[in-house]
Structure formats: C-alpha cells, structure tokens
C-alpha cells in the first residue's frame, strides 16, 4: 500500500478521506487505527456503527470521528482540535470477521503553523501536493470551531 500524507494545523480540524470499492466492501464495517510500530499492532481508534446500514451516522471516540458513505465508497475520518501528539501512521480498515483489510495507509502530520510545509518559500494552500517516493500529500485546512458552535449538524 502507498502511504498518503494528510497535513493539518494544530488546533484546527483535519479531515481524512479513504476511498474504496463500494461493491467489494459491501456490508463491511470500517475502522480507523494507529500503527504503533513497524511490526506492532494497529491500535483501534474508532469504528463505524455496529449496524452497517447506519454507517453514515458519525461516531466519535474522543476528538476523532468516523463516518462511511457506503454507496459512494468513501470513509471519512475527522480529527478535531488537532494536536502534535495526533501525528502518526494510521490505517483505514475494512472489517470482516476478525480480519481487517487495509484500505489506505495514512500519515498524519501536524503543523505548528500554516507556514510549515515541505517546500519552504512557497505559499501553502489546501489541495494535493507533489509526490515523493511512495507517498503523496493532501493538505487540509479547516477553521476552528467557535465557542458554543455545534461541530456537525445533528443526524436524525
């Protein structure tokens, strides 16, 4: 698997997307886990709703949310109030029984400032950046929530 790099700014939100073949993974729950070492386990952070038909409902674990568009084939993970310790290597997984298929390997980078980026001197902007080796970068900037603001519209 190639590794996709997602960069966000500390204190803001970062949205990670993992596309997949909706037919191949039909009926399967998804999960987001953190790789603890080269050969270590992938520690589960959050998984989609226990009922696959309700996978579109956003589920939270702490400041991490997951939601699955099972028809469009896109798993979306939101890391709210991004902090330096959120930086790490993660996986989007498709679950079947006790097994898990890797949909995407994701390297999350937390920048101290929007000016921090790989190509110093250039303006940093959201969107996909140049590739390096087996990884490509997706920059994601989203504003911080104002006090009292509801993070996402309530699901009915």
């Amino acid at each position: 698997h190639n590794t996709t790099v997602f960069q966000g700014v500390a204190g803001q939100s970062l949205q990670v997307s993992c596309p997949y073949d909706s037919m191949k993974h039909w009926g399967r729950r998804k999960a987001w886990c953190r790789q603890l070492g080269e050969k270590g386990p992938c520690q589960r952070v959050v998984s989609t709703h226990n009922l696959w038909l309700l996978s579109f409902l956003r589920r939270w674990n702490g400041s991490t949310a997951i939601t699955d568009d099972t028809l469009g084939g896109t798993l979306t993970i939101t890391l709210r109030n991004l902090q330096p310790h959120d930086a790490g290597l993660y996986q989007c997984q498709s679950l079947h029984g006790s097994e898990a298929d890797t949909l995407r390997k994701v390297l999350v980078e937390v920048l101290a400032d929007p000016l921090d980026h790989r190509d110093a001197g250039d303006l940093w902007f959201p969107g996909e950046s140049e590739s390096f080796e087996d990884a490509h970068v997706e920059h994601s900037i989203s504003r911080s929530l104002l006090e009292g603001e509801i993070p996402f519209p309530p699901t009915s």
Epitope: H85, E109, F132
Partner: antibody, heavy 121, light 113 residues
C-alpha cells in the same frame, strides 16, 4: 542501539552562519521525527523545531523560524540544522533528539551529545 | 505559548531521603479527547544531554528506576524520588508535550549533601 552522533564544536564570527549535523544509527531513520533543542550556558532548554525525515516536513518554534533551517539527507540518515546571522545570543549547545513515537512528534527519547557553538569576534 | 514553571529552583538533600519537585503549566496539558496528560520529565546530569524519565505525567520510560514517580493532572505535576541516590545529582526539567511550541520548565537542580 539507537545513536545520534553530532558534529563537533565550532567557533564562528558574528553575522556568519553555521550548519551542524546529526547522524542517526540503530533504527530506521525515516520512522521517527528529529527535533532540535537549544541550551544556552547554565540555562534551560528551548525547542527549536522538528523535521519528519520521511517527508521533509518541518515545524518550527516561531522564535526560531527565521533563525534556523532544518533539513535531512535520507541517504546518509543525517539531519542538519543551519543557524544564520549569528550573534552572541546564539552561543549555546544545540542538541538533536529523536522522538519516541513511531511517525509521531511526541517526546525526546534519544539525544545526541550536543554541538557547542561559540559566537565571538 | 505554554509556560512551564518549576519549583524549587534547587534543593539539597541527603542520600536516602525523599524528594518532591513541582511543575505548573500555564494551560492544561490534559487532552479532553483521550484523558491523557501530555507532560514529560527529563534528567540532565552534568556534562550530559537530557534523558527522558517520565512521560504521560506518570509513565516511567523503560530502564528508569522505580524510585522515580510522576503524578498530577491538568496544570499541576510532581516528580518524586522516593530514596535519593548519589547518582541522582542532576537538573530535572518538565516539558509540555501537548502543544506547539514544546516548552520546558526552568529546571530543578538536585544537590546531594
């Protein structure tokens, strides 16, 4: 055994620049961030910034953004820090340190022996 | 920036005595998402680089003797050495591992009588 071997002490003139190195061994260089920390004589520690050797992405302490530039050479598993426009305030020991967390920035788990920079006319 | 304040700045004790030193942060180091405190303690012996002792406010790094104990939450933290040994002569620093820029306290210098 994880080791970070830093370049030797330097004496430089005010206004000049210095580039110091930190050669890593005993682990996969691209798996862990490298941090740089300043310690002025008899003083506490100041975090300068970090670099992810896998991507080359850097994050700086705002105080050092125009003062320091961090780079890596993956082929030699070496991290570099260049400090420019040197003044007496830049005289210090500079440490490189490796993060504890896999592909993460947290914690300074392994340290180099330090590079002493003396700025004097 | 998060300001880390350590006290006392120095203390002198006899071998075998118990020692406690304090570290206060200007903002909470408790992550509400996972309920972890992002506070680390380092030991710096004369002429050496710092060494990681404690992380997560209370977890000892591997190889660190169990006489070193970290405690506290939010903004108030403590490092305790249950029975000081001669080799514990050092400066002890606390560090904000929660937010950029990472910041250190001014240090507590431990001297052995």
């Amino acid at each position: 055994e994880v080791q970070l071997q830093q370049s030797g002490p330097v004496l430089v003139k005010p206004g000049a620049s210095v580039k110091m190195s930190c050669k890593a061994s005993g682990y996969t260089f691209t798996d862990y961030y490298v941090h740089w920390v300043k310690q002025s004589h008899g003083k506490s520690l100041e975090w300068i910034g970090l670099i992810n050797p896998y991507t080359g992405t850097t994050s700086y302490n705002q105080r050092f953004r125009v003062k320091a530039t961090l780079t890596v050479d993956k082929s030699s598993s070496t991290a570099y820090m260049e400090v420019n426009s040197l003044t007496s305030e830049d005289s210090a020991v500079y440490y490189c340190a490796r993060s504890r967390v896999y592909y993460g920035s947290s914690l300074f788990a392994f340290w180099g022996q330090g590079t002493l920079v003396t700025v004097s006319a | 920036d998060i300001v880390m304040t350590q006290s006392p700045s120095s203390l002198s004790v006899s071998a075998g005595e118990k020692v406690t030193m304090s570290c206060k942060s200007s903002q909470s180091l408790l992550n509400s998402g996972n309920q972890k405190n992002y506070l680390a303690w380092y030991q710096q012996k004369p002429g050496q680089p710092p060494k990681l002792l404690i992380y997560g406010a209370s977890t000892r790094e591997s190889g660190v003797p169990d006489r070193f104990t970290g405690s506290g939450s939010g903004t108030d933290f403590t490092l305790t050495i249950s029975s000081v040994q001669a080799e514990d002569l050092a400066v002890y620093y606390c560090q904000n591992d929660h937010s950029y820029p990472y910041t250190f306290g001014g240090g507590t210098k431990l001297e052995i009588k």
